[in-house]
């Protein structure tokens, strides 16, 4: 006998009805007398509603459930599950038994929407640029867990410094609380989403914040102007600087140094303590500096994967900012060469020079010459490939055709080191091999 | 130069989560930003975000916001994307690949991808 | 977001013909564009990255012009080998993305 029900679940919301599909084709001559109608759940086998004996022998589940009774006998087994509860939610299995038997199982699923979440500040008041601040976003009753999105004024994602929790309360329903810690800007509007993801609901709430200004104007915060240079695995120094007013102390400093692009902490000093690095634990202060403006930062074993722009934020009663780029590099090793084919080489011939130089940043340019100093253009292949730590290896290949002799240079400079590396072979006119036999 | 190996190909229903995984080797992990990218049969690619396992920083193309989470864990060199919520649209070959920092967006080794398919 | 349009979808051509691929920014990129090749069945690979690095590997006949928005991908003597579909990227800024793709078929 087949028994068929939705293959979907049948989403329910919190103290509604929900009808739980259930369906059979009976033969002709089919009557109520013949139908044994079982509904239990699918994973207890608890017994939920049946009907046998030609009679509907009534609800075991609360008395909150029905079947339809004048559709029964066109095949219509559905089951009408009243009021809804989160703790329904399940699998229903439909048993049919007329001459045959045959059986399937529909999952119901709970729903409710969440409320338009309220948003508290902490502090809420003489709130100033470079404060931290927590942001709580509440949501109300809903059914299941909601995920929850947090995003600035330009609808960029936040999501570090983020902490939801939910509950269920006395219903079972989910109260959900998501905390945003973030540095106040000169302004800026913050935005929570709280999604339902049953039913694709999102409620949503934002709290634009304008700070204080105080009258004497912004803090003034100074950077090098340039990028600071750092080579691959040394400790590198992004200098920022502040003017300290008379009697200031540091418990009046919020310092937070941050990604500049995707606004993530690096480092903070905060209530008059150093809140250490949320940067693998590879940045540092320079705390018995700090009272004197010195709000630099020290970045160590520097990576490739560092290099970009970093944004020293300094508030005290008043806010300011700046932000400063840290360019890694590598030196290149000196040049190894090659050649090929490397004997019995002869005027006329056609070889190919191949220069390679290892683990140096960035990208290297790489210049070829002959004995003269003259350029070498044409024929030049070069490539470049990152090796496990992200530094690259240059491989520049030239192809030429052997004079009477010759010495062909190459060049490989580090353009932000300003750093070149020489590497050269000579090719004799008479039959050599290379490199020379000793 | 380092290799970048996907789990299997998955198929799931509409509504379920999926978590596809990345283990790498060959090249220092924590040295690389690690980024997952769409393709749909036929179609070009879609940027998701970025992990860098160091700080454990992401960056999130706002399109998959909410849609995808990324994590690491640094023992084994593995990188992880779960996939929330899931419709026919994330019918894709998702790819993990890598690239050398946040403002060198470009990828030079890529796994061989995960073929999820949504489907009821 | 910035748009990556490759105007053209299909480019049929005989080997050993030189092909060009024409790749447009809706913003300027500078020179942070780079290219990939993907052949059925596979990942993309990298191939020029930076407007004009070639990645290690990379044969020659790939070359790489242009900057700002307007960018031209091409290829001095196509090989049987260099039949697939052809994407450019903006690396500039996130969220990083990719033109539509241009498949190189043959006549």
């Known amino acids: 006998l087949e028994v068929q029900v939705p293959e979907d679940p049948v989403v329910a919301l919190v103290g509604t009805d929900a009808t739980l599909c259930c369906s059979f084709s009976p033969e002709p001559g089919f009557s109520l007398a013949q139908l044994n109608l079982i509904w239990q759940l699918t994973d207890t086998k608890q017994l939920v509603h049946s009907f046998a004996e030609g009679q509907d022998q009534g609800s075991a589940y609360a008395n909150r459930t029905a079947l339809f009774p004048d559709l029964l006998a066109q095949g219509n087994a559905s089951l009408r599950l009243q009021r809804v509860r989160v703790a329904d939610e399940g699998s229903f299995t439909c048993f049919v038994s007329i001459r045959d038997f045959g059986s399937a199982a529909v999952s119901l699923q709970v729903a409710a929407p969440y409320s338009k979440p309220s948003m508290t500040l902490e502090p809420n008041k003489d709130l100033r640029p470079g404060d931290t601040v927590t942001i709580t976003c509440s949501s109300y009753q809903g059914y299941p867990e909601a995920e929850v999105f947090w995003q600035d004024g330009q609808g960029v994602p936040l999501t570090g410094n983020v902490t939801t929790s939910q509950m269920a309360n006395e219903q079972g329903l989910f109260d959900v609380h998501s905390i945003l810690r973030v540095v106040l800007g000169a302004n800026g509007t913050y935005s929570c989403l709280v999604r339902n993801p049953v039913l694709q609901q999102d409620a949503h709430s934002s709290v634009t914040i304008t700070p204080q200004r105080s009258p004497t104007g912004a803090v003034e915060v100074q950077v090098p102007e340039d990028p600071v240079v750092a080579l691959v695995g040394t400790d590198a120094t992004l200098r920022c600087s502040f003017s300290p007013e008379p009697g200031f102390s540091l418990a009046q400093l919020n310092l937070i140094w941050q990604l500049t692009d995707t606004k993530q902490l690096v480092h903070s000093f905060t209530e008059g303590r150093d809140q250490g690095s949320a940067y693998a634990n590879r940045t540092a202060l320079f705390p018995d500096l700090l009272a004197q403006g010195n709000a630099s930062l020290r970045l160590q074993r520097v990576r490739v994967a560092d290099e970009g722009s970093f944004t020293c934020f300094v508030s005290i009663r008043d806010f300011g900012s700046a932000a400063v780029s840290l360019q890694v590099a590598a030196p290149y090793s000196k040049p190894s060469m090659t050649l090929e084919p490397n004997k019995d080489l002869r005027p006329g011939d056609t070889v190919t020079i191949t220069c390679s130089s290892y683990r140096g940043y960035p990208e290297a340019e790489v210049f070829w010459q002959d004995g003269q100093g003259v350029p070498l253009t044409g024929n030049v292949t070069t490539s470049q490939m990152a090796n496990e730590q992200g530094l690259f290896d240059v491989h520049s290949v030239l192809r030429v055709v052997l004079g009477a002799n010759g010495t062909y240079s190459c060049l490989v400079r580090n353009p932000v080191l300003q750093q070149d590396a020489h590497g050269s072979v000579t090719i004799t006119g008479q039959p050599m091999t290379f490199p020379p036999e000793a | 130069q380092g290799q970048m190996q996907q789990s299997g190909a998955e198929l799931v229903k509409p509504g379920a989560s999926v978590r596809l995984s990345c283990k790498t080797s060959g090249f220092t992990f924590s040295s690389f930003y690690i980024s997952w990218l769409k393709q749909k049969p036929g179609q070009s690619l879609e940027w998701i975000a970025w992990?860098?396992?160091?700080?454990?920083?992401?960056s999130y193309n706002q399109k998959f916001t909410g849609k995808a989470q990324l994590t690491v864990d640094t023992s084994s060199s593995t990188a992880y994307m779960q996939f929330s919520s899931l419709t026919t649209e994330d019918s894709a070959i998702y790819y993990c690949?890598?690239?050398?920092?946040?403002?060198?967006?470009?990828?030079?080794?890529w796994g061989a991808g995960t073929t999820v398919t949504v489907s009821s | 977001d910035i748009v990556m349009t490759q105007s053209h979808k299909f480019m049929s051509t005989s080997v050993g013909d030189r092909v060009s691929i024409t790749c447009k920014a809706s913003?300027?990129?500078?020179?942070?564009v780079a290219w990939y090749q993907q052949k059925p069945g596979q990942s993309p690979k990298l191939l020029i990255y930076s407007a004009s690095y070639r990645y290690t590997g990379v044969p020659d006949h790939f070359t790489v012009s242009g900057s700002g928005t307007d960018f031209t991908f091409t290829i001095s003597s196509v090989q049987a080998e260099d039949l697939a579909v052809y994407y450019c990227q903006q690396h500039y800024s996130t969220p990083w993305t990719f033109g539509g793709g241009t498949k190189l078929e043959i006549k």
């Open positions: 690949a890598r690239h050398v920092g946040r403002q060198r967006g470009y990828f030079d080794v």
């Open positions: 913003q300027d990129v500078s020179t942070a």
């Open positions: 992990i860098y396992a160091g700080p454990g920083y992401t």
